[in-house]
Interface confidence: medium
């Protein structure tokens, strides 16, 4: 179930997945929630003696059992990911951090009259992930009322330092507040030849688009279908970027599909989950568990309830079926996407719905009361 | 159009703008409405981009700069490029577009008459070419639809001007000996219309030329009268296919 409590002066030992810098524990929890494998986190609000660079460190962790040994550590805050917390799921982070310099690659500097205006500039700049604003009391006069737009390869600061009269915050694109616009076009038979930031295996261009939307540096994508001539690139989703923020003119290419990230959308922003079940398809990955259930929908439900499960394959092969149902293989990978997709008539595959805002249930959230 | 003037709204109601929506949206070619669901244009417009789903067709438009993302457009249901067309030659430069949904005819958007097969030898005297193309060889697309009157040039004479190319009987030429008025880049696929016996007919489809409006280098157009059978056959076979697939 959903575990939203935070543990003060507590640090989880072991299970390390990744370490990043975040300005507070809430932001660290958010980063853990949207990381494909993170289940637990520990955040250092104060720096250990002699290790000043560890302050603001957010340590993302995983565990087979769902828990890790706790050790006492002053100034540490630990907690769980909110992967199974339905309504609490949001990538939006509106907090402003006074006295902090969130460092990254400064790609734009301009004068603005307020922090709000600076945050708006960042929200409406395609490349901006976070920002730092120097107030009118900042010690260097030439930087006063300066708005620095920043980015990094992870989408989070490369370091965080306490500096008086600096204020930092994040882009509000994930809050659906960007005014950049929402290019929903999908180009059949076109490929973008721009810089690849990453690639993942996906069953279709729509999943590719959602992956792109939630990747910190993906602006557009090209997906190669199962008919693509190079076998190693079939069902591969290339996440792309460019200096200009726009793709170069697309190349005509049969069996390629291209489109844009929807991270600047206001209404059409997708959820970080994929509802569709793909019949005739098998998703390969690290095996977590196998159970026997009746139907692919039940298999998806099992995967969703198993916190570490990222995707599943349901097999209807005679040797995979028993009286209580057929084999439901729960799987995971380092990036949350299948390591390979194969086409098998007797299989159905899909994804966990653990990151869906509203996991469908018969209980209505809005009740209509009889008068 | 080089040496042309601004048109007024509804003056050439059959003229459409064929635009491509990729990273940005751009006018690529002209076309002519010949039926509620049919546009006639040049095959070479689709050379680089033969995928129907990226094309948008705007009718009843005078000023391209007034097109916004709210402006209604038609989409391509079927693209029929002449089977003998090769982009490495100028011949058979003709294509039919079947629209997803039929057009509503208005005073600003209605069809142009096709000539009959018997019109292959008709002598036309009042001919006009229209389009949003360049106004000079190294120019840019125009916002307001341009028009220019232009005399037809006999094929034998045209062939003499184009010694390096074959001017076939499926082509028709138009232009002034001294140059100065012609179709240009971006006018491709658009209409060359002539008023004959009181009504406008689609005589040519803008196809190619040596530069634009050069002296002794007339514009070359696809001669529509030579393709009447092909046009009618394609429209008919499309209707028959639609009947086969419609529910009983």
């Amino acid at each position: 179930g959903c575990l939203s409590q935070l543990y003060a002066n507590t640090f989880f030992r072991g299970g390390d997945l990744a370490a990043i810098y975040t300005p507070d524990a809430q932001h660290c929890q958010k980063m853990c929630t949207f990381h494909p494998r993170c289940l637990l986190f520990s955040f250092l609000a104060v720096s250990p003696t002699k290790e000043t660079d560890k302050r603001f460190g957010c340590f993302m962790k995983e565990s087979i059992t769902g828990t890790l040994p706790r050790i006492h550590r002053t100034g540490a805050i630990s907690g769980h990911s909110l992967k199974q917390c339905g309504h609490q799921l949001s990538a939006c982070h509106q907090d402003i951090y006074e006295g902090l310099d969130m460092r990254g690659s400064n790609f734009n500097i301009s004068k603005t009259d307020s922090i709000e205006e600076c945050q708006k500039l960042c929200t409406n700049n395609i490349h901006c992930q976070f920002f730092t604003y120097a107030t009118k009391a900042f010690h260097r006069p030439e930087y006063r009322k300066s708005c620095l737009l920043k980015r990094s390869s992870s989408g989070t600061p490369t370091s965080i330092k306490p500096v008086d009269n600096l204020v930092s915050g994040f882009s509000l694109k994930s809050c659906a507040l960007s005014e950049i616009g929402c290019p929903m076009d999908i180009f059949q038979h076109f490929a973008f030849a721009d810089l690849n930031v990453s690639h993942v295996v996906t069953p279709d261009a729509f999943v590719c688009r959602t992956v792109c939307t939630f990747h910190p540096n993906c602006l557009f994508f090209t997906f190669y279908t199962n008919e693509w001539e190079t076998e190693s690139q079939r069902n591969v989703c290339f996440l792309k970027t460019s200096k200009s923020g726009r793709p170069s003119p697309p190349i005509i290419q049969e069996n390629a599909v291209s489109g844009y990230s929807l991270f600047t959308c206001r209404k059409a922003r997708p959820e970080p989950c994929h509802f569709k079940i793909y019949s005739g398809v098998a998703f390969e990955g690290e095996e977590l568990n196998a159970t026997f259930v009746q139907g692919a929908d039940a298999c998806q439900e099992t995967c969703t309830k198993t916190i570490r499960c990222q995707f599943f394959t349901y097999s209807l092969l005679p040797q995979d079926c028993k009286a209580e149902g057929c084999k439901c293989s729960l799987r995971l990978s380092t990036d949350g996407s299948p390591t390979r997709i194969t086409y098998e008539a007797q299989g159905s595959s899909g994804y966990s719905l653990r990151l869906c805002k509203v996991v469908e249930s018969s209980d209505c959230t809005t009740k209509i009361n009889a008068r | 159009i080089v040496g042309g003037t601004n048109s007024s709204l509804g003056e050439w109601p059959w003229q459409v703008s064929l635009q491509v929506k990729l990273v940005s949206q751009n006018h690529m070619c002209g076309g002519s409405i010949i039926g509620r669901q049919w546009i006639l244009t040049a095959a070479h417009c689709f050379d680089g981009i033969p995928y129907p789903d990226v094309w948008r067709i705007y009718g009843g438009i005078l000023n391209l700069s007034e097109i916004t993302n709210k402006t209604p457009f038609s989409s391509i249901k079927e693209l029929i490029i002449h089977q003998k067309y090769k982009m490495s030659e100028g011949s058979y430069d003709i294509a039919l577009i079947k629209l997803q949904t039929p057009l509503n005819y208005t005073e600003f958007q209605k069809p142009i008459c096709l000539p009959s097969k018997a019109d292959t030898n008709t002598i036309y005297t009042n001919c006009w070419v229209t389009g949003w193309g360049y106004t000079k060889e190294r120019g840019e697309t125009q916002n307001i639809l341009q028009k220019a009157t232009i005399p037809l040039v006999p094929n034998e004479e045209c062939q003499k001007k184009y010694r390096d190319y074959v001017i076939t009987k499926q082509m028709i030429c138009a232009g002034y000996k001294e140059g100065g008025i012609d179709a240009c880049k971006g006018d491709s696929g658009g209409p060359l219309v002539c008023k004959h016996s009181g009504r406008w007919q689609l005589v040519g489809i803008t196809s190619w030329g040596e530069g634009c409006a050069r002296k002794e280098q007339p514009g070359v157009y696809t001669k529509v009268a030579e393709y009447i059978d092909w046009i009618l056959e394609k429209i008919q076979s499309s209707k028959e296919r639609a009947l086969e697939t419609s529910p009983a």
């Epitope: - | 070479h44 050379d47 680089g48 982009m87 490495s88 430069d93 010694r163 390096d164 240009c184 030329g209």
Partner: antibody, heavy 126, light 107 residues
Framework: EVQLLESGGGLVQPGGSLRLSCAAS????????MIWVRQAPGKGLEWVSY????????TYADSVKGRFTISRDNSKNTLYLQMNSLRAEDTAVYYC???????????????????WGQGTLVTVSS | DIQMTQSPSSLSAFVGDRVTITCRAS??????LNWYHQKPGKAPKLLIY???RLQSGVPSRLSGSGFGTDFTLTISSLQPEDFGNYYC?????????FGGGTKVEIR
Amino acid sequence: EVQLLESGGGLVQPGGSLRLSCAASGFTFSAYSMIWVRQAPGKGLEWVSYIRPSGGRTTYADSVKGRFTISRDNSKNTLYLQMNSLRAEDTAVYYCARGGLLLWNRELKSNYFDYWGQGTLVTVSS
Amino acid sequence: DIQMTQSPSSLSAFVGDRVTITCRASQPIDNYLNWYHQKPGKAPKLLIYAASRLQSGVPSRLSGSGFGTDFTLTISSLQPEDFGNYYCQQSYTVPYTFGGGTKVEIR
């Protein structure tokens, strides 16, 4: 099958002359523009000259203008390059190539070189 | 004259790698850009014309894009036979000019 075969290359002294020929087969020679391109040893490609199908229009690179003459004999399916006042910097492999016609956006251009001969070496040296 | 600048001047890649070569024109040339491949001691071979059109017989792992001044040749999955020199060439106006070439080696 389109074939282009150059001949006439060889060693020549500075100030001397050579005439290169290119025999064409497998296509209607009289319908295509033809091009000469050269490549100095270990260097890149350099366009030299171009002739229209009828032979009525020719163009040259500045480096050869006034010294080289391109011509064709459509009855013999042959392209020629007459090279006079040769210089050491004219040393190169000379290729003849066919110009492909491209119709795009109302422009019909001999726009790309779709078939090439195997080349003939011209060495200008004393 | 229009200058054509190719980059990189040489590259070394593994079989299966995605390779991108860029070509920049000193002034806009619409789509009048062609790509050729030349193996040592052989004549050049046309790969792509009009910026993005694949010459018949050329494998579809090769593709071209661009318009105006910036152009790209992409080999989606490098094969052993793809080694050699690649040249871009503009035919917007005479004199037709070539890029300096990109030497592609297989690691």
